[in-house]
Amino acid sequence: TLNSVLNSNAIKNLPPPLGGAAGHPGSAVSAAPGILYPGGNKYQTIDNYQPYPCAEDEECGTDEYCASPTRGGDAGVQICLACRKRRKRCMRHAMCCPGNYCKNGICVSSDQNHFRGEIEETITESFGNDHSTLDGYSRRTTLSSKMYHTKGQEGSVCLRSSDCASGLCCARHFWSKICKPVLKEGQVCTKHRRKGSHGLEIFQRCYCGEGLSCRIQKDHHQASNSSRLHTCQRH
């Protein structure tokens, strides 16, 4: 069963974060999510990765999707699973790794012109309706525009970063664009290898905050350059 997966992977026996809760005891505000917390644990590598229960794809990382780990699709707990690489079977876009999408049940590379056009078309359409999609997983459940009284806050629909409050940028999330937090030191960032590759991302990240730049994490040793992790680091 899924719970045996959770238990065998010792999800409840992780070493405690050095600083206690993410926001540190006594503070109601948690630290910004990211690769490192001040005084906290380092980001887990694949070797000691713990199953992460989820209800929606949006809760998982950029390289994951949410599903039952059992083939039959146990109606119980779902966890974040590693995304499917090119030519692997899929049932929806979120299952495919960044730079790919699900076409005819197979993860295929996002053809820049075709796929970007498809996304932008959908974004334009969504802004023409009373029921815009608010974020990635809202494609299944649309919310009325009354929801946007918190305009410019995290999760609000936007067209450009100037629509968002301070500390947020306007970034793509599936078929819409929403205000997301500008990245802080230690958070994972996206280093674009070629001009215009931003258009391929279904889950676009914000840029690094002031005084930070997106660079390869020094202690992140991996076989290939292409899979190295980039994080926001001080200039």
């Epitope: 887990q44 713990q50 209800a55 990382g61 950029t62 390289d63 997983y137 459940t141 919310l143 609000s156």
Partner: nanobody, 124 residues
Framework: KVQLVESGGGLVQPGGSLRLSCAAS????????LKWVRQAPGKGLEWVSH????????MYADSVKGRFTISRDNAKNMLYLQMNSLKPEDTAVYFC?????????????????RGQGTQVTVSS
Amino acid sequence: KVQLVESGGGLVQPGGSLRLSCAASGFPFSIYPLKWVRQAPGKGLEWVSHISRDGGRTMYADSVKGRFTISRDNAKNMLYLQMNSLKPEDTAVYFCARSAGKVVSRASLENDYRGQGTQVTVSS
């Protein structure tokens, strides 16, 4: 800023009940699934329960299934955990949490947004 404030913890005898509450602010509450996690003394974070954004789907760890009930009130930006038939092994600091989502490559409980926690002690 994402803010999560838990309350309702306390000292209770085995077999007793408690209702934890979590007041959320700083983000559009109704579009996020939410969860409760706990941390027993000297242990790591343990996932307890999960609720979908509309409250229609809930999930529980085996250790609390049938005893705990998670719920939410989107109009009030509140998350709840009703804990019945409490056992000494339920003693922990309980946190309400929200996923960090797509800003990390791989999700982990440590990367979640969470509050300061509320202490639950089950002892006779």
